[in-house]
Amino acid sequence: SIPWNLERITPPRYRADEYQPPDGGSLVEVYLLDTSIQSDHREIEGRVMVTDFENVPEEDGTRFHRQASKCDSHGTHLAGVVSGRDAGVAKGASMRSLRVLNCQGKGTVSGTLIGLEFIRKSQLVQPVGPLVVLLPLAGGYSRVLNAACQRLARAGVVLVTAAGNFRDDACLYSPASAPEVITVGATNAQDQPVTLGTLGTNFGRCVDLFAPGEDIIGASSDCSTCFVSQSGTSQAAAHVAGIAAMMLSAEPELTLAELRQRLIHFSAKDVINEAWFPEDQRVLTPNLVAALPPSTHGAGWQLFCRTVWSAHSGPTRMATAIARCAPDEELLSCSSFSRSGKRRGERMEAQGGKLVCRAHNAFGGEGVYAIARCCLLPQANCSVHTAPPAEASMGTRVHCHQQGHVLTGCSSHWEVEDLGTHKPPVLRPRGQPNQCVGHREASIHASCCHAPGLECKVKEHGIPAPQGQVTVACEEGWTLTGCSALPGTSHVLGAYAVDNTCVVRSRDVSTTGSTSEEAVTAVAICCRSRHLAQASQELQ
Amino acid sequence: QEDEDGDYEELVLALRSEEDGLAEAPEHGTTATFHRCAKDPWRLPGTYVVVLKEETHLSQSERTARRLQAQAARRGYLTKILHVFHGLLPGFLVKMSGDLLELALKLPHVDYIEEDSSVFAQ
């Protein structure tokens, strides 16, 4: 029968007695930077080319037993998970292995850098189809390793890495913390985060998604027909590398940004039990388990968006946090969140010719997060329209006044320390789809975009008094681009997008002694692209 | 990565006569920074990745590496260039004493220096 992990990543329409989705990633080359491998194993024979690259440190101490089959264990298993004949994800993908880990499974940042450079040079000498680089390794945060990954990604290579097995914030490790790399955490057959001894999968905002990583059957280096189960975030990353190979084989022109958005879009949502994660990491950790798309084509019509959280600002009075989108993504909205509720909102601003999302801490606050909504919107022309604080009784308003521009997001930023002491008016922004409304003492920023066939609408859900959280979701066929809160008083902790749902968090009414006049409303801006839909139909 | 002392010796002797000036001093106001792994047991002191500014050419990387060796030799330190990077990042990998970091950070074109560290199978 089909192993649990392959079943988990397979859409129902492919599930038969055997795992055989269309196209096995045959147009894609996957580079594996790991231990040596047993290339004559029946699972991977003829599929993996062992390069002559080797850069490994000496094994520690005298207790080490150099025996080929034992040195090959980790790499052989992963090669099998990516492209193995029987238990592989992308059975048609070809692989090339580089040895950067010794028999102990230990390597160096410098050896990994030289390996990445080798791949780049190979790519320049002999350009082939799409390249996926699998980095099933982790070290401490490394500026240089992250920089090298960024350069390789900008050269069109898709990098996939393990989040790490340290039950810790993945942002403290490299290459897991590199924004350009697809970072994968591990889940088990019960969709629980994987526990490994007393530790387990890493988590946090630097993880892009999770994938099967416990009790994964794959090639064993003990013999050429042996199989073994292994667990770890390496195994999870190997699944995503395989899925990426399948997607790229079906659509070789996909950019890294497009591939990442598709991986997120086709993932199983909200199946992970978040209680396993530390409380302060739950909101930052994506509740996504990787899966293959239900069909290899036809996703192009969708407007894809993802949520990007910034690092924590820190607690100083003027601290700010910045969330950035990838180079070929558009920032369609910006929001902020503070666990203490002490924040001064957020704004979209230009930095290096690109819009970024900046959140502002307030005096006495423990710090803030900026949350960017990053979308794939071809031929988009976006700008930010700002209205300074109105000071008048009806609050501040700003709208998209340019012809053909639609509102994709609203942000508000204020200089006063606590808006809660300045009672806002009761706002009724309904029926004004191209307008942002906010507190009279706040400056309001509207993200206005022009793109072929782009249409957006505002959806709201309000409750009479704060009850922890308010949500509003976009319906099928529409994509959440903006998420904000009204009226933005001090009991609102912030707003953020989770998949297609806008979440507004606030302090519970029982602890704040608020009155019902301080209703909290979650405001979602839902968009779709008729242009992308038409283009897709024309293709079919 | 063999690092026999013989190789060390040979390189240093060959560089003794190298010009040892700081003609191309770092641009005013830009200070190169030093980075190392936050997890002590994973640190590999004695090996450093010297990362040069983005547009630095291979020839400049090689020249900067040679300058470091020459200046180190003048101070009585052995160094070994293990690899010169080009293609992804400009820079070089050097085996040297940590005592030389201050000197290396002042070299022209240097953006930052990172102490090597371990990575592990996951």
Epitope: E59, D60, G61, T62, R63, F64, H65, R66, Q67, K70, C71, S73, H74, L101, C103, Q104, G105, K106, A138, N165, F166, L196, G197, T198, L199, E214, D215, S220, S221, V228, S229, Q230, S231, G232 | K39, D40, P41, W42, S118, F120, A121
Partner: antibody, heavy 123, light 112 residues
Framework: EVQLVESGGGLVKPGGSLRLSCAAS????????MNWVRQAPGKGLEWVSS????????SHADSVKGRFTISRDNAKNSLYLQMNSLRAEDTAVYFC????????????????WGQGTMVTVSS | ESVLTQPPSVSGAPGQRVTISCTGS?????????VHWYQQLPGTAPKLLIS???NRPSGVPDRFSGSKSGTSASLAITGLQAEDEADYYC???????????FGGGTKLTVLG
């Protein structure tokens, strides 16, 4: 349920040999390092031997080096300790214990232990 | 003699707080390797009590806490209860021995 069950203990004469086994179940055995720890009657815990997940790394305490050999069979989810040239001071309860193999990045705690098997070396 | 040093015994009355120290050297605790603590009740296998210096596995009461500083570590037990009477062992990794090391063990007696 995660479980380790030791077997093979017994009475043996000094100079004799014994082979202990530890059967593992309920977890991905081949991703864990495995250990033997012993406890002489009325005494403390003493680490004896370790073996990494793929057997590439083996370590023994100085007190047993050259006499004891640790091994494993991942296909059978089993750990072994071959004890030769046994001495009276090897008399102890022998426990097998697991720790996740972090490839020397981290040395984890022994989070699961077997119930132990008694080895008595006496003439 | 054990590589890690623990006091042979400690005692305390119910409800009291006791601490058990564990002293190592620059090749084990001082080298940055984590310290783990085990509880062994009479006639049973050891049970993990604290991992990674200060982390409590699920099911371990929050009366137990661990800390580490320099070349030593300590286990603290607050609100002492009769069922805490047991032997306690610290453990770490030693790079010079390429293996694990245990403390000699501390017998905790709950008075009264």
């Amino acid at each position: 349920e995660v479980q380790l069950v030791e077997s093979g203990g017994g009475l043996v004469k000094p100079g004799g040999s014994l082979r202990l086994s530890c059967a593992a179940s309920g977890f991905t055995f081949s991703s864990y390092s495995m250990n033997w720890v012993r406890q002489a009657p009325g005494k403390g815990l003493e680490w004896v031997s370790s073996i990494s997940s793929s057997s590439h790394y083996i370590s023994h305490a100085d007190s047993v080096k050259g006499r004891f050999t640790i091994s494993r069979d991942n296909a059978k989810n089993s750990l072994y300790l071959q004890m030769n040239s046994l001495r009276a001071e090897d008399t102890a309860v022998y426990f097998c214990a697991r720790d996740y193999d972090f490839h020397s990045a981290y040395y984890d705690a022994f989070d699961v232990w077997g119930q132990g098997t008694m080895v008595t070396v006496s003439s | 003699e054990s590589v890690l040093t623990q006091p042979p015994s400690v005692s305390g009355a119910p409800g009291q707080r006791v601490t058990i120290s564990c002293t190592g050297s620059s090749s084990n605790i001082g080298a940055g390797y984590d310290v783990h603590w085990y509880q062994q009740l009479p006639g049973t296998a050891p049970k993990l009590l604290i991992s990674g210096n200060s982390n409590r596995p699920s099911g371990v009461p929050d009366r137990f806490s661990g800390s580490k500083s320099g070349t030593s570590a300590s286990l603290a037990i607050t609100g002492l209860q009769a069922e805490d009477e047991a032997d306690y062992y610290c453990q770490s990794y030693d790079s010079s021995l390429s293996g694990s090391v245990f403390g000699g063990g501390t017998k905790l007696t709950v008075l009264g």
